[in-house]
């Protein structure tokens, strides 16, 4: 039996801060789990993941490419990303795996959130030439 | 046939580090339903789980050892891992692997065990 | 960490007898009517080996007189009639929670 996952398909980002939820099919606090996003069409880089259960909130650690922390309730996971750059623009795939107790419970790969980090363009005001 | 096979054990010096393997055949370490974990057994002594990896490649540890341990696998090879830092006198042990199943996470094949003796 | 306290610690016995075994965790390690508890036994110098998954259900390949019983917290591993080569350490695992724990032992030595 796999899980169902639901993630918004594009987030677009010009304040280099977002937040992502995986909204799942699954009662969070029946059992242990770890959640993790991963980045990349083949979820390449684990770039978030935290691990909790029914007893106590999880303490989310990140990739040292990325600033990440993360909260649930019962049926979501929100991951938050901040100091993103435009080189962070891709697909990011929300992953949960329940372990304990058994039997162990996977999610079934969703379309993935393409999240878009907008380039800042800084305006300079060019000043005619005084003749 | 499933077989487990661990190698890697020996005299190492208090201080020091641990890396042993474990063969796998009979069935890939990769595909969903198994993972394989890793118990130990000091001289006379009861068994100790230390950790776990399924899969997907997530691992899970022992508390008590979590600081010093890393389970890690090379799907290419079928092969897993233990890396096992900082020995101490009380790390002496029979080191075995062994597969679960999904289901119950019961133990239903293990190794032969590899002989670690951690003094100087 | 659940605890699992196994008794006897060790027991003497003779071939054809009876023998019972039981664990006693430190909290249910039941989850939706199935009990994660596990029994194993290990001769001297070998590994150990899988005799009763989920407290009740023969492994493949073990003999008929091995039987497992109980829910909850306690659990009981009987042996009908003790066979010469059923000498050996016994064990109980449970795996309902992280981190995996094993009772201490029950050694099984003729009598």
């Known amino acids: 039996n796999k899980i169902l996952v639901k993630q918004s398909p594009l987030l677009v980002v010009d304040s280099n801060e977002v937040s992502l939820s995986c909204r799942y099919s699954y009662n969070l606090l029946a059992k242990e789990f770890r959640a993790s996003l991963y980045k990349g069409v083949n979820s390449d880089v684990e770039v978030c993941v935290g691990n909790g259960n029914f007893t106590y909130q999880p303490q989310f650690r990140s990739n040292a490419e990325f600033n990440c922390d993360g909260d649930f309730d019962n049926e979501t996971v929100t991951f938050r990303l901040w100091n993103l750059h435009v080189n962070h623009t891709d697909i990011y795939f929300c992953k949960i795996e329940f372990m304990y107790p058994p039997p162990y419970l996977d999610n079934e790969r969703s379309n993935g959130t393409i999240i878009h980090i907008k380039e800042k363009h800084l305006c300079h005001t060019q000043s005619s030439p005084k003749l | 046939e499933v077989q487990l096979v661990e190698s890697g054990g020996g005299l190492v010096q208090p201080g020091g580090s641990l890396r042993l393997s474990c063969a796998a055949s009979?069935?890939?370490?990769?595909?969903?339903?198994?993972?394989v974990g890793w118990i130990r057994q000091a001289p006379g002594k009861g068994l100790e789980w230390i950790g776990e990896?399924?899969?997907?490649?997530?691992?899970y540890y022992n508390p008590s050892l979590k600081s010093r341990v890393t389970i890690s696998r090379d799907n290419s090879k079928n092969t897993l891992y233990l890396q096992l830092n900082s020995l101490r006198a009380e790390d002496t042990a029979v080191y075995y692997c062994?597969?679960?199943?999904?289901?119950?996470?019961?133990?239903?094949?293990w190794g032969q065990g590899t002989l670690v003796t951690v003094s100087s | 960490d659940i605890q699992l306290t196994q008794s006897p610690s060790s027991l003497s016995a003779s071939v054809g007898d009876r023998v019972t075994i039981t664990c006693r965790a430190s909290?249910?390690?039941?989850?939706?009517?199935?009990?994660?508890l596990h029994w194993y036994q290990q001769k001297p110098g070998k590994a150990p080996k899988l005799l009763i998954y989920?407290?009740?259900s023969l492994q493949s390949g073990v003999p008929s007189r091995f039987s497992g019983s109980g829910s909850g917290t306690d659990f009981t591993l009987t042996i009908s009639s003790l066979q010469p080569e059923d000498f050996a350490t016994y064990y109980c695992?449970?795996?309902?929670?992280?981190?995996?724990?094993f009772g201490q032992g029950t050694k099984v030595e003729i009598k």
């Open positions: 909290q249910s390690v039941d989850f939706h009517g199935i009990s994660f």
């Open positions: 009979g069935f890939s370490l990769s595909t969903s339903g198994v993972g």
């Open positions: 989920a407290a009740s």
């Open positions: 990896i399924y899969h997907s490649g997530s691992t």
């Open positions: 695992q449970q795996s309902y929670r992280s981190p995996r724990t």
């Open positions: 062994a597969r679960y199943k999904y289901d119950y996470y019961d133990f239903d094949y």
